[in-house]
């Protein structure tokens, strides 16, 4: 069954953790969908993000960070491991000094912390998909 | 009650219809939610766009088509009529020789025609919205 | 062993120009950000000016804006910084520092090189 | 921009923990690191990432990070301790800052 789409939900992050979205673009990669993954610093919507990972599917992939209210240096990745029409499984884990990115298990984009990951309250997934898994995944100690 | 989004319906227009929509941002303005909506030469989503009207919430609305298969001479605009969490009204009236776009009861864009209207088979509203009314009315004869 | 050879320090007039380098070897230059940081005598560190490893991204103290350009050259392993408009308070020992771990563009998680430091005294 | 705030001096006996703060940064985000620096030497780095020890820096010290304020700890002060410290923080894309700096007296 369908998660609501925006999808927000609580997370606490450290190195270790791992974010896992299973979902599929809601039109073709012609009309340029997109997807976006945002990390929140706190609960509210408009509140600064760690890590923002938007994928305009078919050209390009944007990842920033916003810190306080404003867009820093946007990092732009031409890579594109995802299928028009076809299911994708993203998978963003926290490693000690970045982000990294998993498509369909293949490790396409990473994204150096700019922010402490532990600064992550809250995850939302939203654009121009269908949403079947979210899951925040705790390293255990 | 919320129509699904995507939202597409089959459509003929020509000089005096005017299709009405009524919705609401999914997201706060500082997030750049997006409304779109086409006019389809086809019942597919693949197809032609005789009108494409494009509003990134406060920022600005792009408009184009799509011939061919490929995109033509986009025209801007940074004038914004919609208002941050409120929802909207808009208003696509096919005139003789433009479409005008009304926000809300308020004259805020135009678009010349570049493939006459009858050519529409098919409109589409979609991204990051909620939407509550889609209305097509023909002029009667 | 990691090594940070400033150069290029000198006595100027206000108004004037000096351009300080900093040889580095020991180490893969290109694959780090690099930055300057100062210290008036008797005084407290002041970062200056930081550049990203492949050069393309610069970032100032407001002091300095528009008057100082930070460069690198990855291919003779120097960084380089563009003094115009010396101003007496820009008296300082000007140090060249090496960006800790692999970040692209950071200071974030300090400078784990540090030259022995040029000294820039700016006087009539 | 903000800005870092350390005592000027700070003294403790041969032996004992000596405790340095800087306070005015958003450590919740960001990461402190500290320098020793000794008269006529350029900084050397002994903590970073709020509690990471480079290698060649003694156990005995140690950082800490909560709010708004990060710590300094030298836990059994040597003689050779005896130098000024300085807090730094930054992010990735903006001005790195440093805090004033204190001396460490051991007494």
């Known amino acids: 069954s369908l998660l609501p789409v925006p999808y927000t939900e609580a997370a606490s992050l450290s190195t270790g953790s791992t974010v896992t979205i299973k979902g599929r673009p809601l039109a073709c990669f012609l009309n340029e969908p997109y997807l976006q993954v945002d990390f929140h610093t706190e609960m509210k919507e408009e509140s600064d993000i760690v890590f923002h990972f938007q994928v305009c599917f078919g050209r390009r992939v944007v990842m920033n960070s916003r810190e306080y209210g404003a867009w820093k240096q946007q990092v732009e990745s031409k890579n594109m491991p995802f299928q028009d029409g076809q299911e994708f499984e993203l998978s963003i884990s926290v490693l000690p000094d970045k982000y990294q990115v998993m498509v369909n298990g293949q490790s396409s984009y990473t994204f150096d912390h700019r922010i402490k990951p532990e600064a992550v309250k809250m995850v939302q997934v939203w654009r121009d998909i269908s949403l079947t898994k979210f899951n925040v995944s705790y390293l255990k100690r | 009650s919320l129509l699904p989004v995507p939202y597409t319906e089959a459509a003929s227009l020509s000089t005096g219809s005017t299709v009405t929509i009524k919705g609401r941002p999914l997201a706060c303005f500082l997030n750049e939610p997006y409304l779109q909506v086409d006019f389809h030469t086809e019942m597919k989503e693949e197809s032609d766009i005789v009108f494409h009207f494009q509003v990134c919430f406060g920022r600005r609305v792009v408009m184009n088509s799509r011939e061919y298969g490929a995109w033509k001479q986009q025209v801007e605009s940074k004038n914004m009529p919609f208002q941050d969490g409120q929802e909207f009204e808009l208003s696509i009236s096919v005139l003789p020789d433009k479409y005008q776009v009304m926000v809300n009861g308020q004259s805020s864009y135009t678009f010349d025609h570049r493939i006459k209207p009858e050519a529409v088979k098919m409109v589409q509203v979609w991204r990051d919205i909620s939407l509550t009314k889609f209305n097509v009315s023909y002029l009667k004869r | 062993q990691v090594q940070l050879v400033e150069s290029g320090g000198g006595l100027v007039q206000p108004g004037g120009s000096l351009r300080l380098s900093c040889a580095a070897s020991?180490?893969?230059?290109?694959?780090?950000?690099m930055s300057w940081v100062r210290q008036a005598p008797g005084k407290g560190l002041e970062w200056v000016s930081t550049?990203?490893?492949?050069?393309?991204?610069?970032s100032y103290v407001d002091s300095v804006k528009g008057r100082f350009t930070i460069s690198r050259d990855n291919a003779k392993n120097t960084l380089y910084l563009q003094m115009n408009s010396l101003k007496p308070e820009d008296t300082a020992v000007y140090y060249c520092?090496?960006?800790?771990?692999?970040?692209?563009?950071?200071?974030?998680?300090?400078?784990?090189?540090w030259g022995k430091g040029t000294l820039v005294t700016v006087s009539s | 921009n903000f800005m870092l705030t350390q005592p000027s001096a700070v003294s403790v006996s041969l032996g004992q923990t000596a405790r340095i703060t800087c306070q005015g940064g958003?450590?919740?985000?960001?990461?402190a690191n500290w320098y020793q620096q000794k008269p006529g030497q350029a900084p050397v780095l002994v903590i970073y990432?709020?509690?990471e020890r480079p290698s060649g820096i003694p156990e005995r010290f140690s950082g800490s990070s909560s709010g708004d304020t990060a710590t300094l700890t030298i836990s059994g002060a040597q003689a050779e301790d005896e130098s000024d410290y300085y807090c730094?923080?930054?992010?990735?894309?903006?001005?790195?800052?440093f805090g004033g700096g204190t001396h460490l007296a051991v007494l």
């Open positions: 520092t090496k960006s800790q771990g692999g970040i692209s563009f950071s200071t974030q998680y300090g400078m784990d090189y």
């Open positions: 020991e180490f893969t230059f290109s694959r780090y950000s």
């Open positions: 550049i990203n490893s492949g050069g393309g991204s610069t």
């Open positions: 958003n450590f919740g985000r960001y990461y």
């Open positions: 990432k709020d509690s």
């Open positions: 730094q923080s930054g992010s990735v894309s903006d001005n790195a800052v």
